[in-house]
């Protein structure tokens, strides 16, 4: 006969682990504010800017009271999916102007990507029915002109700012009912 | 040697305006965010304002908002502060703080601060 | 908005003693934006800590900060009579920036 089996693997605290993710949330949401506004003061740019293929807010802050865990999780990871995927175009296609903000994007992208990652591990852990892969995305047209460009990269920090946003007050309000 | 220097506080009646200044000297100016912060006679710090270095972000304390502008001239090395419809509450010390290296290190250097008396 | 919370009120303490001043905030946020100062009676405020424990430009190294999520300390590892002032704690993380209602050190 084998080794006598361990104590039962126990599984992290929900709770701690959701924190994790609202701390995570939270620097993104700062850093993404602070980087807006550093685009905005290299390229002043009237109005607000619309990219037809960024995915549509996912909530208002009123309706917040109505969300269940798995909604919020799975919305949330699929919203941030395709910000990831926007930020990744645009530094592959933003053109020359956007390459002062190259650290910057990069880091945007690292800690999206660590975000996703994260929220994979909390879904796990709070034994939530995993996503289906996601399907292909057609590809993001590269833009028209440097203006397209630099209107692009306001538009999606300004999606991703409002849909962080959302996120830390979602989290800390899901906190409450684990 | 980073120097803030405000001006213009004063006596003002309660519906009045006031302008402040803020001048600033010893680094580049341009290159940074800079904040008003105020605090009322024996209470603590409240924060007021914030403009980054090129003006396109402004953030205001719901306390402020719709009444006081901030802005800033780079060329001039200077920070304002417009105050209308000033009332009794927004009497204070008014303090004009820099930023430190990055946006999230905190107000590493302030001014002496300029008296705002609001009264009838 | 962001509350932060400072405890005690008032400390009453020795030179030479060890001072712990709390700073309680109401929702979790990172470390990194935590800030500290220190105020003198008819002084401007002055940084002290910033994003937590890193030391500003000519404090010295009796000042320390630690902490994490909402619960945050700043340490006087041994008192010496310029410290006797009110401490604030404030966070930069969101929108309005907030400071704590500051903790006064007073001599005992």
């Known amino acids: 006969p084998g080794p006598p089996p361990g104590p039962p693997r126990v599984s992290p605290d929900p709770r701690a682990e959701l924190d994790s993710t609202v701390l995570l949330t939270r620097s993104l949401l700062a850093d993404t504010r602070q980087l807006a506004a550093q685009l905005r003061d290299k390229f002043p740019a009237d109005g607000d800017h619309n990219l037809d293929s960024l995915p549509t807010l996912a909530m208002s802050a009123g309706a917040l009271g109505a969300l269940q865990l798995p909604g919020v999780l799975t919305r949330l990871r699929a919203d941030l999916l395709s910000y990831l995927r926007h930020v990744q175009w645009l530094r592959r296609a933003g053109g020359s102007s956007l390459k002062t903000l190259e650290p910057e994007l990069g880091t945007l992208q690292a800690r999206l990507d660590r975000l996703l990652r994260r929220l994979q591990l909390l879904m796990s852990r709070l034994a939530l029915p995993q996503p289906p892969p996601d399907p292909p995305a057609p590809p993001l047209a590269p833009p028209s002109s440097a203006w397209g460009g630099i209107r692009a990269a306001l538009a999606i920090l300004g999606g991703l700012h409002l849909t962080l946003d959302w996120a830390v007050r979602g989290l800390l309000l899901l906190k409450t009912r684990l | 040697e980073v120097q803030l220097v405000e001006s213009g506080g004063g006596l003002v009646q309660p519906g009045g305006s006031l302008r402040l200044s803020c001048a600033a000297s010893g680094f580049t100016f341009s290159s940074f965010g800079m904040h008003w912060v105020r605090q009322a006679p024996g209470k603590g710090l409240e924060w007021v304002a914030y403009i980054t270095p090129g003006s396109n972000t402004i953030y205001y304390a719901d306390t402020v908002k719709g009444r006081f502008t901030i802005s800033r001239d780079n060329a001039k090395n200077s920070l304002y502060l417009q105050m209308n419809s000033l009332r009794a509450e927004d009497t204070a010390v008014y303090y004009c703080a820099r930023e430190y290296y990055s946006y999230d290190e905190g107000f590493a250097y302030w001014g002496q601060g300029t008296l705002v008396t609001v009264s009838s | 908005e962001i509350v932060l919370t400072q405890s005690p009120a008032t400390l009453s303490l020795s030179p030479g003693e060890r001072a712990t001043l709390s700073c309680s905030v109401s929702s979790l946020i990172p470390s990194k934006y935590l800030h500290w100062y220190q105020q003198k009676p008819g002084q401007a405020p002055r940084l002290l800590i910033y994003?937590?424990?890193n030391l500003a430009s000519g404090i010295p190294a009796r000042f320390s900060g630690s902490g994490s999520g909402t619960d945050f300390t700043l340490t006087i590892s041994s008192l010496e009579p310029e410290d006797f002032a009110v401490y604030y704690c404030q966070q930069g993380v969101d929108v309005p920036f907030t400071f704590g209602q500051g903790t006064k050190l007073e001599i005992k």
């Open positions: 994003r937590t424990s």
